[in-house]
Each structure stands twice: as C-alpha cells, then as structure tokens.
Amino acid sequence: AAIGSCSKEYRVLLGQLQKQTDLMQDTSRLLDPYIRIQGLDVPKLREHCRERPGAFPSEETLRGLGRRGFLQTLNATLGCVLHRLADLEQRLPKAQDLERSGLNIEDLEKLQMARPNILGLRNNIYCMAQLLDNSDTAEPTKAGRGASQPPTPTPASDAFQRKLEGCRFLHGYHRFMHSVGRVFSKWGESPNRSRR
C-alpha cells in the first residue's frame, strides 16, 4: 500500500493513532454490523461469538514490548487482520442481494470501510516508527510474536461455522484494539520518554 505523507509532530501523530484505535475498538463499527448481516443476532448465538484464546497478542504481551517492538507487532497483526477481512468480505452479501433480503446497507458499508481504516492506521504506524527511528534515544527492539499465527479460520464444515469463526475473529480484533489503545494511552509526551 502506498504510504501517505507523515506528520513530523510526535504529539499529532500519537493523537491520530489514539483516535484511530478508539474507533477500531468500537464494536458498532464492525462486529455488530457483521452479526446483523450474518443473522447471528440471537442471544444463544452471541454466546458462541467469543474469541479463541491466543488468536491475538494479549495486553500483557503488548505492554512488555518496547515502543518499536510494539509498533512492529501491531503492524504485523494488522497485516494478518487485513488478510482475514478480505476473506470475510468475499462472503458478504453483494449490493444486489441487499434489497432482496432487507439487510441494512449501512451495516455492509461499515464492514467494507474496515480495511481502508486499517490501512490508514498502518500508515500512521509507519510514520510513528520513522519518527522513533529519528529520535535521539535508542531503545532495544523487543518484537513480540504478533498473533501466534495469522488468525486463520479453523476448517469449517459449513457456512454457518464460518460465520461463527468470523464473529469470534472480530470479537478478538476489537478486544485487541482496546488493548492497543490502552498501550498508546501510556506513551509519553515525546518520542524520548515513556510513561510506564
């Protein structure tokens, strides 16, 4: 993906990252529309929509990383998320199906905005990494494992299982972005200082 222009202002960049992660932990932007579109909006089914442990790095893991390592892990995990979202998008209803099924077009639009939004976040991650590389204080790069593997769907016997897998994945994604937001909130006022 093409990298957009980067702000040289650490505080501006951190503010943008915090704003983006705030939006991405909001389930009304991705998980909730997915649940409605896939017909999973039933209490019994919602219970099955819990992430599989280990699919995403934990908040504890993220907190243990240096800032560069954290950005690397975040970038790598979002790369996996992009692939998985592309796969989910293939299975979404097309515009032609909407009127025939009465589905909310707003829900479908929210789902299709997820990938562009993540690309925007990754652009700012790249910019922040550049900024940290140019700051005078070196910090050991302690990269995390990222998601243990790209969060891959378990072999699904049918479409319904795939829908549940997608639901669990998105649940985990929102939880992960919540953790990311909490880590960013602890970052210091300058690229040289970190509040622990």
Epitope: R36, L98, G102, I105, E109, P116
Partner: antibody, heavy 117, light 111 residues
C-alpha cells in the same frame, strides 16, 4: 410474489384525520424497513415517512412537511404498515404509496387522499 | 436537505437514438463504498418502476438499454436505443441521508 396493497384513502376535510393501511405479502415483512411515498396530482414524488425493522428498534423518520402530524407504524404479526395522518392540510392531497427498503423496487398501486373543504 | 436537480425537464428523442438525463445533487450522495442514487420510470396512472439502484446497478427485469453512471454530485441515466415504450417521466432519488428526496422529473417523448 411481492405484493403491497394500500387502503384507507378518501375525502377528508382540512384538520381532519385518516389512517392508511398497507397489506404486505410475498416476503418476510418483519426484516424490512418500510416507507410511505406520496405524489400530489400532476406533481413529483415525495418521501413521507420510514420505519425500520425490530432489529433497529422500529426507529421512525419523517419528512419535515409531515412531522408531528403523521405517525408511521407497523404490525409485523399481520404484515401491515400504517400511516396515521392528523391535522390534514390541503397540500397533503396526493396518491400515497407503500414501498419497501432504501430504493423502491416494489410499489403498491397507491391510495388517493383528498383534503378539501 | 439534499436537493436533486434533473435536466432537462423534458426531451424528445427519435426512436433508436440515445436519451441522456442528468441528475445533480446539492451535495455528495456518495461514500467511498456506494453511490446512493437511484432511477425510476413512471407512466401515467401507474406507480413508479425502479430502473437503476446505487447509480449503476440494473434492476432485475429492466432492459439492458437502460444504464446509469456517476458519483458524488453528478449522475446520468442513459437509454439507448430508445424504444416507443420508453415514453415516460423519469425520476432520480437519493438515499444518502434522511430526508430522502427525489428530482423534479424529466419527461421523455419519443419522436
């Protein structure tokens, strides 16, 4: 086959009331957002009101020209859509159509409302 | 409210030729995903009939001589080749935000 059948139109005096009904069949009514659209004689089309489905908490929306006078409602168990019209004005004279979704692939034949002294 | 302005108000086109109707919105009716603009045909004494939805999607059962294009604020309905039965009034409608509005209509006459 999708069918929408409006009824309840007629002649009413200004400031009077009327309740329009729309019987829906041939589709799963309760999953759809439904709308009323009207057309004054010899004029263009005007969206009037919208009601969403249960999953969207039956949210309702109105054109400014009918706000606080008209009420859209639905009965999913009977696959019925309603438009309660109060404090009618001469400019409410129109053919009223019941239509489904955000773009209107299915229309009823309409019911004519005439507001006149 | 978003105002949709159609032009021309009326036009006469010879059988087999192309009819082009424009719909201009007072502000964008598009997002990065969809163009929320739809086209209808109405004949006297009948309810309107959906031709095109989301700017360019042909409704099922509508002849392929109808096509729609455009994004943002400028949209076009093309009919080619025009046939006798296409004599009607054509309306655009947006569903970008409430209140939804219609254009004023374009009356097509076949010469």
């Amino acid at each position: 086959e999708v069918q929408l059948q409006e009824s309840g139109g007629g002649l009413v005096q200004p400031k009077g009331s009327l309740k329009l009904s729309c019987a829906a069949s041939g589709f799963t009514f309760n999953t759809y957002a439904m709308n009323w659209v009207r057309q004054a004689p010899g004029k263009g089309l005007e969206w009037v009101a919208r009601i969403r489905s249960k999953s969207d908490n039956y949210a309702t929306y109105y054109a400014d020209s009918v706000k606080d006078r008209f009420t859209i409602s639905r009965d999913d168990s009977q696959s019925m859509l309603y438009l309660q019209m109060n404090n009618l004005k001469t400019e409410d004279t129109a053919m009223y159509y019941c239509v489904r979704y955000d773009w209107f692939a299915y229309w009823g034949q309409g019911t004519l409302v005439t507001v006149s002294a | 409210d978003i105002v949709l302005t159609q032009s021309p108000a009326s036009l006469a086109v010879s059988l087999g030729q192309r009819a082009t109707i424009s719909c201009r919105a007072s502000k964008s009716v598009s997002t990065s995903v969809y163009n929320y603009l739809h086209w209808y045909q109405q004949k006297p004494g009948q309810p309107p009939k959906l031709l095109i939805y989301l700017a360019s999607n042909l409704e099922s059962g509508v002849p392929a001589r109808f096509s729609g294009s455009g994004s943002g604020t400028d949209f076009t309905l093309n009919i080619h080749p025009v046939e006798e039965e296409d004599a009607a009034t054509y309306y655009c409608q947006h569903s970008r935000e409430l209140p939804w509005t219609f254009g004023g209509g374009t009356k097509l006459e076949i010469k």
